[in-house]
């Protein structure tokens, strides 16, 4: 029950995280104009990974896409790549984890297969989350660097008479969405990996084997234990280890070191 809950919760958390990563990637507010000097501005600039926008105080908003690929900064391209890789891995992870969910039965899929799929999706979520966090952090670092550079060159005077105020950019809402979403995806991935441990059989699975001669065979148990015949009509697998709430068909019998044939 705990394994199912952990797996289910991991899936839901990852789903929310990946939705957040997609939202952050699409958002226009990766960087927003710093309003420290002028809290009420007549022209407000903000930029995303795919376009830059200007919102006038009149309410008019104009957005322009970055229609060049080669002219864009390498860092921006890297951030785009990291976010897309994060989304792709996350999407594949979600697809895999749906089939791995313990509450969903698909044919005669064994627990070991489900465990492997859960682990795979968990690793994918972890990498997806790390990609998103890395992408957002690279962009944030780029902003911080540019912010202090533009602060140093804030006013460039023309003969000391005319001031040209350089637009400074600070963290936009998308960065926080990205960080949180990446974190959630990471947590979801870890939860899936933990769930995988509970799904996988912890012991080596041996099949119980009985040997018999052509005649009437008797298996002798040392230590004065009662002998039992090998292939009796009423022979059943006995529940010798209860590792938790398991159904009868999930239970394996293990040979004792004292069993001789």
């Amino acid at each position: 029950m705990a394994v199912t809950a952990c797996q289910g919760l991991g899936f839901v958390v990852s789903l929310i995280g990946i939705a957040g990563i997609i939202a952050a990637t699409c958002m226009d507010q990766w960087s927003t104009q710093d309003l420290y000097n002028n809290p009420v501005t007549a022209v407000f600039n903000y930029q995303g990974l795919w376009r830059s926008c200007v919102r006038e105080s009149s309410g008019f908003t104009e957005c322009r896409g970055y229609f060049t690929l080669l002219g864009l900064p390498a860092m921006l391209q890297a951030v785009r790549a990291l976010m897309i890789v994060g989304i792709v891995l996350g999407a594949i992870g979600l697809l895999v984890s749906i089939f791995a969910l313990k509450c969903i039965r698909i044919g005669s899929m064994e627990d070991s297969a489900k465990a492997n799929m859960t682990l795979t999706s968990g690793i994918m979520f972890i990498v997806s989350g790390l990609c998103a966090i890395a992408g957002v952090s690279v962009f944030a670092n780029m902003l911080v660097t540019n912010f202090w550079m533009s602060t140093a060159n804030m006013y460039t005077g023309m003969g000391g008479m005319v001031q040209t105020v350089q637009t400074r950019y600070t963290f936009g809402a998308a960065l926080f969405v990205g960080w949180v979403a990446g974190g959630l995806t990471l947590i979801g991935g870890v939860m899936m990996c933990i769930a995988c441990r509970g799904l996988a059989p912890e012991e080596t699975n041996y099949k119980a084997v009985s040997y018999h001669a052509s005649g009437h065979s008797v298996a002798y148990k040392p230590g004065g234990f009662k002998a039992s015949t090998g292939f009796g009509s009423n022979t059943k697998n006995k529940k010798i280890y209860d590792g938790g709430a398991r159904t009868e068909d999930e239970v394996q019998s293990y040979p004792s070191k004292h069993d001789y044939v």
């Epitope: 501005t41 007549a42 022209v43 903000y46 200007v54 006038e56 105080s57 009149s58 322009r64």
Partner: antibody
């Protein structure tokens, strides 16, 4: 067609207050901001402030803060400007105008003359 | 506050003449985000409210005759009337539309001989 109809001329005593109205018609009132501009006789234009009729949000010229209070009534599509503690320096023609892209003013009211005299 | 300086304060011209009005701002009105200059030109005739002529420094408002042309970038702007008509007798104001408070120039009075 778009129209901004302002209230009539006012003659008021110093120290009192006056409320100038600006009724909008021919467009969605809440979709555009309304600006108020002051023009003293024979002088240039001075920006007073702006109001968002949809949200009621305002932004004032710091130099005139406390002098003017901007409000808007969505139901009657009317913007108001209340001028308080009037002095002779407040005698002017006051215009309301619609604020559009480019942060420009495309339609203006005819102006309301406010004369402060004892 | 951004200070807008217009020159000349008044100008006497003859009909058909080409006129150039100047406007300078104390700070750049150029916005890098959309590569636009936030300067607006208005025309005010006696006894009337101002009329919008040009916004974004060079975009002509619909219905404005094409003899009116706005140009310039950063801090220096001009309004050019290619062939002055009698109905162009008015005061022309430039306005900073970039930063609050939205300041106006003192105006240039255009008179006909």
């Amino acid at each position: 067609q778009v129209q901004l109809q302002q209230s009539g001329a006012e003659l008021v005593r110093p120290g009192t207050s006056v409320k100038v109205s600006c009724k909008a018609s021919g467009y969605a009132f809440t979709n555009y901001l309304i600006e108020w501009i002051k023009q003293r006789p024979g002088q240039g234009l001075e920006w007073i402030g702006v109001i968002n009729p949809g949200s009621g949000g305002t932004n004032y010229n710091e130099k005139l803060k406390g002098k003017a209070t901007l409000t808007a009534d969505k139901s009657s599509s009317t913007a108001y400007m209340q001028l308080s503690s009037l002095t002779s320096g407040d005698s002017a023609v006051y215009f309301c105008a619609r604020y559009v892209k480019g942060n420009a003013l495309d339609y203006w009211g005819q102006g309301t003359s406010v004369t402060v005299s004892s | 506050d951004i200070v807008m300086t217009q020159s000349p304060s008044s100008l006497t011209v003859t009909a058909g003449e080409k006129v150039t009005l100047s406007c300078k701002s104390s700070q750049s009105l150029f916005n890098s985000g959309n590569q636009k200059n936030y300067l607006t030109w208005y025309q005010q005739k006696p006894g009337q409210p101002p009329k919008l002529l040009i916004y974004w420094a060079s975009t002509r408002e619909s219905g404005v005759p094409d003899r009116f042309t706005g140009s310039g970038s950063g801090t220096d702007f001009t309004l050019t009337i290619s062939s002055v008509q009698a109905e162009d007798l008015a005061i022309y104001y430039c306005q900073n539309s970039y930063s609050f408070p939205l300041t106006f120039g003192a105006g240039t009075k255009l008179e006909l001989t």
